[in-house]
Amino acid sequence: SGTTNTVAAYNLTWKSTNFKTILEWEPKPVNQVYTVQISTKSGDWKSKCFYTTDTECDLTDEIVKDVKQTYLARVFSYPAGNVESTGSAGEPLYENSPEFTPYLETNLGQPTIQSFEQVGTKVNVTVEDERTLVRRNNTFLSLRDVFGKDLIYTLYYWKSSSSGKKTAKTNTNEFLIDVDKGENYCFSVQAVIPSRTVNRKSTDSPVECMGQEKGEFRE
């Protein structure tokens, strides 16, 4: 129960990609505002997005402090223009989010093929190591810095002239594959965290083909 005309937030949902993390909820406010709090299981609550009429709150700055922690958020509802007002139990109306562990649950963003270079019958394909908002020693860490060898890339490649696809895997950001001389190949990559049971795979990268700008050829 709560103050008249104030409704509790519902459908609290974490939206997170490469650790950029936003909490979303419903409903769109009518004569009410929201404040969000976040904490770790053992930590203190920290308030964010004070008295907002938005139905989302960017919590990235909090979760990147320790991406392996499990976080809980809650959304408080207050009557607009009377934010000191509380529910009948003497507390503001609020709703808890599901628990969220960034390291285990953040979605893997769509990867990008940074470059490919052919030398004879070998092609080296390099995946861009995307920067995250996770910091260590005042520098932003890359996805590889954060996940280490937990992060795998799968390369899909095929002759431009044929439909038969092949794959290769790496726990670095580089592939070295054999190709047939004189043939053009196309490439796409996918990020995977094998140890996960949810959000294991990214979407596939855009396809890049030999004979286009990103490539380089050397005999």
């Epitope: 795998i152 696809k165 794959t167 895997k169 594959i177 949810v198 294991r200 596939d204």
Partner: antibody, heavy 117, light 107 residues
Framework: EVQLQQSGPELVKPGASVKVSCKAS????????VYWVRQSPGKGLEWIGY????????FYDENFMGKATLTVDKSSSTAYMQLNSLTSEDSAVYYC??????????WGQGTTLTVSS | DIQMTQSPSSLSASVGDRVTITCLAT??????LAWYQQKPGKAPQLLIY???YLADGVPSRFSGSGSGTDFTFTISSLQPEDFATYYC?????????FGQGTKLEIK
Amino acid sequence: EVQLQQSGPELVKPGASVKVSCKASGYTFTHFNVYWVRQSPGKGLEWIGYIDPDNGITFYDENFMGKATLTVDKSSSTAYMQLNSLTSEDSAVYYCARDVTTAVDFWGQGTTLTVSS
Amino acid sequence: DIQMTQSPSSLSASVGDRVTITCLATQTLDTWLAWYQQKPGKAPQLLIYAATYLADGVPSRFSGSGSGTDFTFTISSLQPEDFATYYCQLVYSSPSTFGQGTKLEIK
């Protein structure tokens, strides 16, 4: 509990086609590729190919291109392998299995295919 | 395509023996290799993934080592239930070839 339940044994005539099913349960079907493997009588394991249930993209060993066609039905969490133009050489046990990128961790019980006139 | 050569093809040993099986690849696999056990009439069962990691529920007498092109699978002290056929599998690339298998029999 992760399970892959395959369809029962098949006895078919040469030249015919057959469709083997593999129903997955106990995990999110679209998160893991499904491998298919053949084992001929008294022989070793041969990799046929795999399908990514999320997008339907398939990969085949060259020896099975044109012989095997892999599909999925996401709504029923079921993978299928159709084998066509069957000959006695195709008589074998066919397995589906769940790919976890670093290995294949759960296997179906196998479907025995006998091709005989 | 990468080829896998597994040896020996068969092996006789006694309970309590230490047994070693090798798998050689024609190109480097880093550690993209798995080992399986198969008993007659049954599906294969994963024992080792990523060359050295023991799969869930697998006894510690099984181990894997190696990287690049040379891999070894070891059973430190054979138990009666270990008599079976063992396969290596490259998971680095497609086609995801299996070794020819090693049949482990009671001496």
